[in-house]
Amino acid sequence: MNSNNKRAPYWTNTEKMEKRLHAVPAANTVKFRCPAGGNPMPTMRWLKNGKEFKQEHRIGGYKVRNQHWSLIMESVVPSDKGNYTCVVENEYGSINHTYHLDVVLVPRGSLEHHHHHH
């Protein structure tokens, strides 16, 4: 992008953001994505239930891949349930997108592959 062509943040791949409700079996991994662009390149931060999401807020913490605009939580547990909001911002503006995570307890002896949608 031309360095003179200043631009507020915008979503670059809304297809990957369509599924807002994630119902995930306990112990699985969940990934939330907010692919974005802008000039200067925006920064991304994450909120849980409207508050800053800190590593110490969950056992094992979480992973953020800035180049992939993603938040990853492994081995989810019921306390991970809630709303997760990505906030993408630069000096020209700010955009956000919220996902809802529900952690499903799968009974023992159920299907090995518990199908759910992202």
Partner: antibody, heavy 119, light 107 residues
Framework: QVQLLESGGGLVQPGGSLRLSCAAS????????MSWVRQAPGKGLEWVSV????????HYADSVKGRFTISRDNSKNTLYLQMNSLRAEDTAVYYC????????????WGQGTLVTVSS | DIQMTQSPSSLSASVGDRVTITCRAS??????LNWYQQKPGKAPKLLIY???NLQSGVPSRFSGSGSGTDFTLTISSLQPEDFAVYYC?????????FGQGTKVEIK
């Protein structure tokens, strides 16, 4: 054109250390995440580690966690893998690979360097 | 970690055959699935990324489909240069695990 060239492989005793390097050219190195992938003789591919373009994010396979360290020097366009406490099961060809932008698909690979751990 | 299971582990086919390889994930991985081809003594080559996108320069006889837990790599008409080992790889979780591979041999 994109090129990745690994070096630093060789024979090392169990418990020893080795540092692999991957020299990159033909692209803006700091814009891309890089990974190491290994392949034991006659076996399948095993992902080892990844590092983000600016070095801010790293992750490791459980099999190497605490023993291997991935790093990069963007001023030298070079990726590294420091391997400590080496075991016989670490014997493999080690490949460095570039991730596609916005996807963790490895679109370019080096030719590989062989690491042999044996007494 | 997320486990990837490929089937079959090997298959024999003839030039011109339609070949299908499947990959199953131990949990939903959305469309975060790549396919690679590897020939003896060579580095792997990316064929398909994000389940269904053909990598630049890869012949159109290769295609990928699926999402969630079940994925397929199809070679519509097998060519002599396609005899190789094929691997799937997930990149949904931080550890980008590969399937065990499928060897495509000449019948």
């Amino acid at each position: 054109q994109v090129q990745l060239l690994e070096s630093g492989g060789g024979l090392v005793q169990p418990g020893g250390s080795l540092r692999l390097s991957c020299a990159a050219s033909g692209f803006t190195f700091s814009d891309y995440a890089m990974s190491w992938v290994r392949q034991a003789p006659g076996k399948g591919l095993e992902w080892v580690s990844v590092i983000e373009g600016d070095g801010s994010y790293t992750h490791y396979a459980d099999s190497v966690k605490g023993r291997f360290t991935i790093s990069r020097d963007n001023s030298k366009n070079t990726l590294y893998l420091q391997m400590n406490s080496l075991r016989a099961e670490d014997t493999a060809v080690y490949y460095c690979a570039r991730e596609k932008t916005y996807s963790s698909a490895f679109d370019y690979w080096g030719q590989g360097t062989l690491v042999t751990v044996s007494s | 970690d997320i486990q990837m299971t490929q089937s079959p582990s090997s298959l024999s086919a003839s030039v011109g055959d339609r070949v299908t390889i499947t990959c199953r994930a131990s949990q939903d991985i959305s469309s975060d699935l790549n396919w690679y081809q590897q020939k003896p003594g060579k580095a792997p080559k990316l064929l398909i990324y994000d389940a269904s996108n053909l990598q630049s320069g890869v012949p159109s006889r290769f295609s990928g489909s699926g999402s969630g837990t079940d994925f397929t790599l199809t070679i519509s008409s097998l060519q002599p240069e396609d005899f190789a080992v094929y691997y799937c790889q997930q990149h949904y979780s931080p550890s980008h695990t590969f399937g065990q591979g499928t060897k495509v041999e000449i019948k």
